[in-house]
Amino acid sequence: QRLPRMQEDSPLGGGSSGEDDPLGEEDLPSEEDSPREEDPPGEEDLPGEEDLPGEEDLPEVKPKSEEEGSLKLEDLPTVEAPGDPQEPQNNAHRDKEGDDQSHWRYGGDPPWPRVSPACAGRFQSPVDIRPQLAAFCPALRPLELLGFQLPPLPELRLRNNGHSVQLTLPPGLEMALGPGREYRALQLHLHWGAAGRPGSEHTVEGHRFPAEIHVVHLSTAFARVDEALGRPGGLAVLAAFLEEGPEENSAYEQLLSRLEEIAEEGSETQVPGLDISALLPSDFSRYFQYEGSLTTPPCAQGVIWTVFNQTVMLSAKQLHTLSDTLWGPGDSRLQLNFRATQPLNGRVIEASFPAGVDSSPRAAEPVQLNSCLAAGD
């Protein structure tokens, strides 16, 4: 089923960084056009355990007050699934020295629930978004971002952690999902596919986009990521789909042009501060929201996901650079670093705008199959 054409209301209309033109329905491949690629090839369809990069590469974390951000986020969290006690430890080299949570990969062994039991939870991410079934929630107000336009100094840490490319963000990037729902940005990273193969984590009516950006935030109610993991609303992720467009995206180029320097797994570089908000769509008012999980071990639940309706445009060359430059574990290319979509298990995805419109000519009024749950309570 194709997404309806609705001037400015068309779910997942294109444009970003100042480009507001929504895509028409012909611009979005239908489910028939692109097979529903739940997993990267060769991956077993085990619930809750497939693919994804260091999206929640949240390791030993502590409030930070300088260039690398409010929290230390080099690789993986020091925490197991909530409820599993663990001694505090220095974890800067977990990925190299090996502790259970660092030994996961996309596809193959070990099964993620063995790495972290939470990966077998009932409310996991990513999910398939079906706008027709989303509950329109007028209480979902435009997102508020403050301090995202960073000066060039100090430089930021850009790292190939073997699962993704991650940019650690400094303190001072504040985001509000609504009144009293305030967060601090910690890091951002990307998920992508391979040549001719899309690699977003979330899908829309089965359609997978070329890539996806995740900006990970910690609730201001918590001082540390390990305190917030598993707590409802403890973490929040802003997600946007990346699509191919005719022009180079200058904001993304500031990062993509540096990927060659960090081609090797575990390598990193310093990049000038930039306008982080320019990496996101320009329309902060139209989005989908649901409660899910980290998409990589430890797969902790309680994460508030906000998926922008508008997409971000990158050139074909930029998307190729993203998917074809980095190397991961075992001399393999870092590609297809996305987890399979997970079952909703009764969850209702909310929309900040009336996304569920029946595209047939008979429908004079929007059809909302789900009602809004009290958002923001």
């Epitope: 220095n90 800067a92 060039p152 100094l153 100090p154």
Partner: antibody
């Protein structure tokens, strides 16, 4: 590999000027912020100042503000430190280094002696 | 202000610990440099505990509260040098701040 080489040091009298240069190679110079650090004889390291990748932003330590100016020419892969109104306590080995938050590569340094 | 002990002495094969004190330094990232006589400093630890390539695993770092620590295990004669801690402090005009340095003597 990354190489940084300072030049321009020497013996000068108080109140005069000197310009230090740092030639960079082995990396894309225009991608990185650059830092000057100095070390007085027998003393510790002291940050002098730094400049952003494109030269648009500079920061200085208090003791050199208004006297020292950091600049760069990305086309020439070169970093500069213009030192005016030099004082005896500016005597030190001056190092250029790559990076702002931390300095991952350093030059070998050039000695500046300010003496009457 | 970052405070380091002026000197630390240790026998070969033992473990040396060099501290760097500062108000709530645990909220900042600490970087460590080694400097041998007549040479330029070398980065040995960055972001509290990460090691640049080429630095032996014997070098490690930690940071919490008001103290950051550089630990050198199985100390060798070649480790004798001055060690400096450093932070970025955007809240002050001195954006890059170095500790006073610690002379490590291998007995």
């Amino acid at each position: 590999q990354v190489t940084l080489k300072e030049s321009g040091g020497g013996v000068v009298q108080p109140g005069t000027s000197l310009r230090l240069s740092c030639a960079a190679s082995g990396f894309t110079f225009s991608n990185y912020a650059m830092t000057w650090v100095r070390q007085a004889p027998g003393k510790g390291l002291e940050w002098v100042g730094l400049i952003s990748y494109d030269g648009s932003v500079t920061h200085y330590t208090d003791s050199v503000k208004g006297r020292f100016t950091i600049s760069r020419d990305n086309a020439k892969n070169s970093l500069y430190l213009q030192m005016n109104t030099l004082r005896a306590d500016d005597t030190a080995v001056y190092y250029c280094a790559r990076g702002s938050g931390y300095q991952e590569h350093w030059g070998q340094g050039t000695l500046v002696t300010v003496s009457s | 202000v970052l405070t380091q002990p002026p000197s630390v002495s240790v026998a070969p094969g033992q473990t040396a610990r060099i501290t760097c004190g500062g108000n709530n330094i645990g909220s900042k990232s600490v970087h460590w440099y080694q400097q041998k006589p007549g040479q330029a400093p070398v980065l040995v630890i960055y972001y509290d505990s990460d090691r640049p390539s080429g630095i032996p695993e014997r070098f490690s770092g930690s940071n919490s509260g008001n103290t950051a620590t550089l630990t050198i295990s199985r100390v060798e004669a070649g480790d004798e040098a001055d060690y400096y801690c450093q932070v970025w402090d955007s809240s002050s005009d001195h954006h890059v701040v170095f500790g006073g340095g610690t002379k490590l003597t291998v007995l």
